[in-house]
Interface confidence: medium
Amino acid sequence: TIPPHVQKSVNNDMIVTDNNGAVKFPQLCKFCDVRFSTCDNQKSCMSNCSITSICEKPQEVCVAVWRKNDENITLETVCHDPKLPYHDFILEDAASPKCIMKEKKKPGETFFMCSCSSDECNDNIIFSEEYNTSNPDLLLVIFQ
């Protein structure tokens, strides 16, 4: 998708629903495209992206991509349709409410990607599997 400052008019009358029949409304996601990042060797990071966008299409989810090479670290935040690959990878975790980073094989760099389907969920990117929990007390600790 594209951020609001370059969005074209859209009028899609189709009602998009999830597998349970619940209506899918356009999501709010962090949308800073690619930015340099200081996120490294941490269990979780904030995106430090100040742009919250309404995704263009109801089916789109939030995506974050963390990349590290010999020169720098970048974090990409966007909206994207999970039916379409992103960076040649399928968004297999698109239904998750949290952005749990998974490593992908990319030559010459360390590449992690996550996707999620709650508002602004790509603002909090989680690397450690121990944080992938439904314990609400732990969630409060992580995200405060």
């Epitope: 008019s9 209506v23 919250t52």
Partner: antibody, heavy 116, light 107 residues
Framework: QVQLVESGGGLVEPGGSLRLSCAAS????????MSWVRQAPGKGLEWVGR??????????EFAAPVKGRFTISRDDSKNTLYLQMNSLKTEDTAVYYC???????WGQGTLVTVSS | DIQMTQSPSSLSASVGDRVTITCRAS??????LNWYQQKPGKAPKLLIY???SLQSGVPSRFSGSGSGTDFTLTISSLQPEDFATYYC?????????FGQGTKVEIK
Amino acid sequence: QVQLVESGGGLVEPGGSLRLSCAASGFTFSNAWMSWVRQAPGKGLEWVGRIKTTYSGGATEFAAPVKGRFTISRDDSKNTLYLQMNSLKTEDTAVYYCTLDLRKYWGQGTLVTVSS
Amino acid sequence: DIQMTQSPSSLSASVGDRVTITCRASQSISSYLNWYQQKPGKAPKLLIYAASSLQSGVPSRFSGSGSGTDFTLTISSLQPEDFATYYCQQSYSTPPTFGQGTKVEIK
């Protein structure tokens, strides 16, 4: 389809308290930021406050005129949003709408009248 | 807080007329502007988001434009059901703020 139904409005004296509820259905409530917006009789729209998702800590934000007096909470297990209003003033008299933050879904509104 | 100023505050028009409502922000809000329509006794209805994106189900006679501080809502050919009050709202920063409204009445 998406439905937001407010309840709990009514007549209350200045200094009193009231709790509004908003029952949500037809969408994944726990994934959504939710807001309250109000409209005084014959006046324009005024944003009251919002609550973010529990996944991101359930942070709340408020407009200056209600900060410290109003609180917003959510019960994702009941798909319900709440607005607790304390120390009510006559200028809080308005129709209060529950909304899916920044998007097209709004409830029908519930009237709160603060008067002695 | 960002102030939103709409003009005119009211206007009279006939069916078939082209109607333009403007909204000015007190500082740049990029394209973070929404337009709502409200009829008496009803909840507001989102028409346009992100300054120019038409909300699904909204007739194509409604269009939005602008960025930065100056925005426009245009109704290309006014229909009987379009007589209502229109509000702009910025979603660039918290608190989101609304314009004071523009009432479109029948001439």
